[in-house]
Amino acid sequence: MAVTACQGLGFVVSLIGIAGIIAATCMDQWSTQDLYNNPVTAVFNYQGLWRSCVRESSGFTECRGYFTLLGLPAMLQAVRALMIVGIVLGAIGLLVSIFALKCIRIGSMEDSAKANMTLTSGIMFIVSGLCAIAGVSVFANMLVTNFWMSTANMYTGMGGMVQTVQTRYTFGAALFVGWVAGGLTLIGGVMMCIACRGLAPEETNYKAVSYHASGHSVAYKPGGFKASTGFGSNTKNKKIYDGGARTEDEVQSYPSKHDYV
């Protein structure tokens, strides 16, 4: 029961996490900036992984997509890649984990197969969560670096000159959504891996073999010789190749407490 609960909870937590990763990836508020040197109106800029937006106090809002691929910063491309990899792995993990759920019966799927699928999905969730956390952290680092550069390189310019606009770079809502979502996916993955341990049947490394004698008190000696006590018809030590040994697959036998450890 606890295993089913752990697996189910892991699935739900991962599902929420992956939904969050998708939401964060699509959001525009990865970076937000307030322009201070604007004497007209409060201008609020925010950027996402796919487009940049401007919002003014007058209510005007405009967004423009990054239509070029090659010209964009490598760091932005890396973040995009990490988030997409996280989403893809998470989606595959969800698909696998649905079939791995103990509460869902699909044909005659054994617990060992479900355990393997649970472990696979758990690992996928962990990697997915790590990808999201890494992506968001790389972007956050890029923002911090940009902020320090923009404040350090302030200089006024006239006559064809250029100056860095004094902006306050702040972490957008998407960063926090991404961090939390990545964390949830990671936790969900760990829970799935824990559930896997409970799902796996405790099997021995050897196949249980039951021995059946043709005579009354028959034992096996090393080397495959059958020793007779004299009560049976076989009074001589005769090598038996087709002896009474049968695996459980071949002969139906009554279970013994020694059959399973």
Epitope: L35, S52, V54, E56, S58, G71, N146, V162, T164, V165
Partner: nanobody, 122 residues
Framework: QVQLVESGGGLVQPGGSLRLSCAAS????????MGWYRQAPGKGLELVAV???????NYADSVKGRFTISRDNSKNTLYLQMNSLRAEDTAVYYC????????????????WGQGTLVTVSS
């Protein structure tokens, strides 16, 4: 390389009109606030008028009612229509734009033009 090129300046009589233009070119991603500043001989830099992407405007008190700022976002061009010009409007007019580049849309820069001279004299 981003460039802001002003044009339309020249000699005009008091009460006359001029239309200044400023064209921004280069690998620009988005231009945010654009504005006109002027520097009269022997004086400091003075704000004339500014306009946001959403067409919110602000004018210096000395030009209100006489000057009109406008922009064409699709062409990355800024205009200043100057009417009822006075002798005190004589100055070098600079174009200014807050913009970000296609290569780094996360960083904003202020670019300045070389300036165009407007002389109001009879």
């Amino acid at each position: 390389q981003v460039q802001l090129v002003e044009s339309g300046g020249g000699l005009v009589q008091p009460g006359g009109s001029l239309r200044l233009s400023c064209a921004a070119s280069g690998s620009i991603f988005m231009i945010n606030v654009m504005g006109w500043y002027r520097q009269a001989p022997g004086k400091g830099l003075e704000l004339v008028a500014v306009i946001t992407r959403g067409a919110s405007t602000n004018y210096a008190d000395s030009v209100k009612g006489r000057f009109t700022i406008s922009r064409d976002n699709s062409k990355n061009t800024l205009y200043l229509q100057m009417n009822s010009l006075r002798a005190e409007d004589t100055a070098v007019y600079y174009c200014n734009a807050d913009l970000n580049l296609a290569s780094d849309p996360f960083k904003w820069y202020t670019y300045w033009g070389q300036g165009t001279l407007v002389t109001v004299s009879s």
